[in-house]
Interface confidence: medium
C-alpha cells in the first residue's frame, strides 16, 4: 500500500505540474478535477500546491490562481465569477465523457473560496477502504 | 519585497529565558500560504532548524531539540516570536526568522532575516 | 528524525562542474531545498523542488534526486560560488524540517 500511494503522489505531482500545458492529454486533468471536486480538496496536501503551476500563474507574485475544481460554491457570494467563469466549468465535472479543451482551463484568483483541505488524507482514506 | 527582522537582547545568562521576535514587513502573517520559522546556527557549526508556525497557530518544533522552545505568532503586530527557556551556552547561536511556503512536494524558507547572534554567558 | 548527510567539504576548479550531494530517507518522498551561506551572512536559497530556480540566481545552478540522493550541481564554478550549501527537506513524518549538516565549497 505504500508504494501505491507514492506512486499515486508522483502521478499527481505530474498532473499538477503540467496541468493545462497539452490540450490533447487532458485525461489526468479531468481525473483529478473531479477528485477535487467530489472530496472537496484541493492540492495533494496543500492548495498552494497549484501556484506553483507555470500556467496558474497571475502576474503579481501574490495574485494565485487555482482549477475551478477547488472552488468551494457554498462559500462563494460574487455571482459574477460564479455565473461566468466557476458553474460553466464545475458542470463540466458532471459530464467527464465530453472532452475539455484547453481554453476551458478554468483559473481565476484563489485564497478565500477555495478549499483547504488537500486531497491526499481522503484519497489514501479511500485507498484503504477498497 | 517581503523582509524580516530579528530582535532581542545579545547576552543571556545560563538558566534564564531568552525571548526573540521577528518583525515581518511586506507580507501578511495572516497568509495560509506561508509558514513562518526560526533557524539557529551554533558559532561555526552548521543550520538547525528549531521550529515552525502557521497563520492558524499550529506550531512544530525541532524533536531532536528538547522541548525548550515554544513559537507564537501576533499577527496583529505582524510579528512572530521565539522562548527559550533555561539556556545553556550550547545556545550560543546566531537566531534567524525565515518564511516558508507551503507545498506538498519540498520544503523551503524563501525569506530570511540577517540573523541575531545570542550569547549565553554569566 | 529523519537526517540529511552532506559531504563536509568539496573542492573544484574554476570553471569546472561540481555536485553536492544530499543524502537521506526522507528524500525518496521529498525533494531538497538549496540554500548557499557565505560567512556572516544569511542563507539564501538557490534551488528547491523538481527544477525550480528563484529569481536572480544564475541559470550554473541545477537540482536533480535519485532514490534517497538529492544532488545541487554548478556548471562552471565562479570564484563568488565559494561558500557553505545545505540542503533542506521535510522529514519523513512530513511535519518535521531537518537541514543537512552543510557542504564547505572551495574554488580553486
Known amino acids: 500500500r505504500a508504494q501505491l500511494e507514492r506512486s499515486l503522489r508522483d502521478v499527481v505531482e505530474k498532473t499538477i505540474q503540467k496541468y493545462g500545458t497539452n490540450p490533447e492529454e487532458t485525461a489526468a486533468e479531468e481525473s483529478w478535477d473531479y477528485v477535487q471536486f467530489q472530496l472537496r480538496c484541493c492540492g495533494w496536501h496543500y492548495p498552494q500546491d497549484w501556484f506553483q503551476v507555470l500556467i496558474l500563474r497571475g502576474n503579481g507574485s501574490e495574485a494565485h490562481r487555482v482549477p475551478c475544481s477547488c472552488y468551494n460554491l457554498s462559500a462563494t457570494n460574487d455571482s459574477t465569477i460564479l455565473d461566468k467563469v466557476i458553474l460553466p466549468q464545475l458542470s463540466r465535472l458532471g459530464h467527464l465523457a465530453r472532452s475539455r479543451h484547453s481554453a476551458d482551463i478554468c483559473a481565476v484568483p484563489a485564497e478565500s473560496h477555495i478549499y483547504r483541505e488537500g486531497c491526499a488524507q481522503g484519497l489514501q482514506k479511500w485507498l484503504h477502504n477498497n | 519585497q517581503v523582509q524580516l527582522q530579528e530582535s532581542g537582547p545579545g547576552l543571556v545568562k545560563p538558566s534564564e529565558t531568552l525571548s526573540l521576535s521577528c518583525t515581518v514587513s511586506?507580507?501578511?502573517?495572516?497568509?495560509?500560504?506561508?509558514?513562518w520559522g526560526w533557524v539557529r546556527q551554533p558559532p561555526g557549526k552548521g543550520l538547525e532548524w528549531i521550529g515552525t508556525i502557521y497563520s492558524s497557530g499550529s506550531a512544530y518544533y525541532n524533536p531532536s531539540l528538547k522541548s525548550r522552545f515554544t513559537i507564537s505568532v501576533a499577527t496583529s503586530k505582524n510579528q512572530f516570536s521565539l522562548r527559550l527557556s533555561s539556556v545553556t551556552a550550547a545556545d550560543t547561536a546566531v537566531y534567524y526568522c525565515?518564511?516558508?511556503?507551503?507545498?506538498?512536494?519540498?520544503?523551503?524558507?524563501?525569506?530570511w532575516g540577517q540573523g541575531t547572534l545570542v550569547t549565553v554567558s554569566s | 528524525s529523519s537526517e540529511l548527510t552532506q559531504d563536509p567539504a568539496v573542492s573544484v576548479a574554476l570553471g569546472q562542474t561540481v555536485r553536492i550531494t544530499c543524502q537521506g530517507d526522507?528524500?525518496?518522498?521529498?525533494?531538497a531545498s538549496w540554500y548557499q551561506q557565505k560567512p556572516g551572512q544569511a542563507p539564501v536559497l538557490v534551488f528547491y523542488g523538481k527544477d525550480n530556480r528563484p529569481s536572480g540566481i544564475p541559470d550554473r545552478f541545477s537540482g536533480s534526486t535519485s532514490g534517497n540522493t538529492a544532488s545541487l550541481t554548478i556548471t562552471g564554478a565562479q570564484a563568488q560560488d565559494e561558500a557553505d550549501y545545505y540542503c533542506?527537506?521535510?522529514?519523513?513524518?512530513?511535519?518535521?524540517?531537518?537541514f543537512g549538516g552543510g557542504t564547505k565549497l572551495t574554488v580553486l
Open positions: 511586506g507580507g501578511s502573517l495572516n497568509s495560509y500560504n506561508y509558514y
Open positions: 525565515a518564511r516558508g511556503y507551503r507545498n506538498s512536494w519540498y520544503a523551503l524558507f524563501e525569506y
Open positions: 533542506n527537506s521535510r522529514d519523513s513524518s512530513g511535519d518535521h524540517l531537518v
Open positions: 526522507s528524500l525518496r518522498n521529498y525533494y
